[in-house]
Interface confidence: low
Amino acid sequence: LQDPCSNCPAGTFCDNNRNQICSPCPPNSFSSAGGQRTCDICRQCKGVFRTRKECSSTSNAECDCTPGFHCLGAGCSMCEQDCKQGQELTKKGCKDCCFGTFNDQKRGICRPWTNCSLDGKSVLVNGTKERDVVCGPSPADLSPGASSVTPPAPAREPGHSPQ
């Protein structure tokens, strides 16, 4: 025997209290698949969360973060404060990177400058709070007749790493 509930489409639930007829999901709830015996409560985007997509009878609301914050976690389950390049987020808010470290994004932690000497190279461009050092050829490579230095590639757009 076929389960009568299997005929209930998304956006409805199989109402056991009413002879298993398909009832529409109540306001602020949804069912994204057919044959459901209950509808799920819609997610509410409040506080620092903003509504990116309204809840419908067949799909949950989707949230993103208010300006100055970015999403973390599956489905934007958390919002984390943005900082400027050259800073990292601490418990007391955004703090400048310490000398010898940098952060070229609006999120994440300050990372140490590359140690050029470990690769037998010299520092071609000094590091800043926002940018890593650029390593150049070792001093021996800069002797007369050596090939010219290739300029560093432009820095990528910050703050666009995948979620």
Epitope: G47, V48, L72, G73, S77, M78, C79, E80, Q81, E88, L89, T90, K91, G108, I109, C110
Partner: nanobody, 122 residues
Framework: EVQLVESGGGLVKPGGSLRLSCAAS????????MSWFRQAPGKGLEWVSH????????DYADSVKDRFTISRDNARNSLYLQMNSLRAEDTAVYYC???????????????WGQGTLVTVSS
């Protein structure tokens, strides 16, 4: 389900006082740092203060230091912000938020209340 509900906002004259409350439910309140943020009209969110789970570690933004006092009552699952010597520039929606510290340099404010409006005006 984690819930944070602020209350205590209202209209107050400059120099006056207000006490905000944040009632928490749905999680082990005493395990978490809690923060107050505020958002003035047309401006971004500003961190105001936070307090550790046990209440032993407290810090404030420079803009409110010596005027605001954060506290908590873990038995009542409640967070408070006592605001004295209020100024017009303290006018904002005040939010409480749960902090989830996951790794150095990353503070996730993973749950927020709906906010309570504080208006300081003569």
């Amino acid at each position: 389900e984690v819930q944070l509900v602020e209350s205590g906002g209202g209209l107050v004259k400059p120099g006056g006082s207000l006490r905000l409350s944040c009632a928490a439910s749905g999680f082990a309140f005493s395990d978490y740092y809690m923060s107050w943020f505020r958002q003035a009209p047309g401006k971004g969110l500003e961190w105001v203060s936070h307090i550790s789970g046990s209440g032993t570690t407290i810090d404030y933004a420079d803009s409110v230091k010596d005027r605001f006092t954060i506290s908590r009552d873990n038995a009542r699952n409640s967070l408070y912000l006592q605001m004295n010597s209020l100024r017009a520039e303290d006018t904002a929606v005040y939010y409480c938020a749960r902090e989830d510290i996951r790794m150095p340099g990353t503070t996730d404010f993973d749950h927020w209340g709906q906010g309570t409006l504080v208006t300081v005006s003569s």
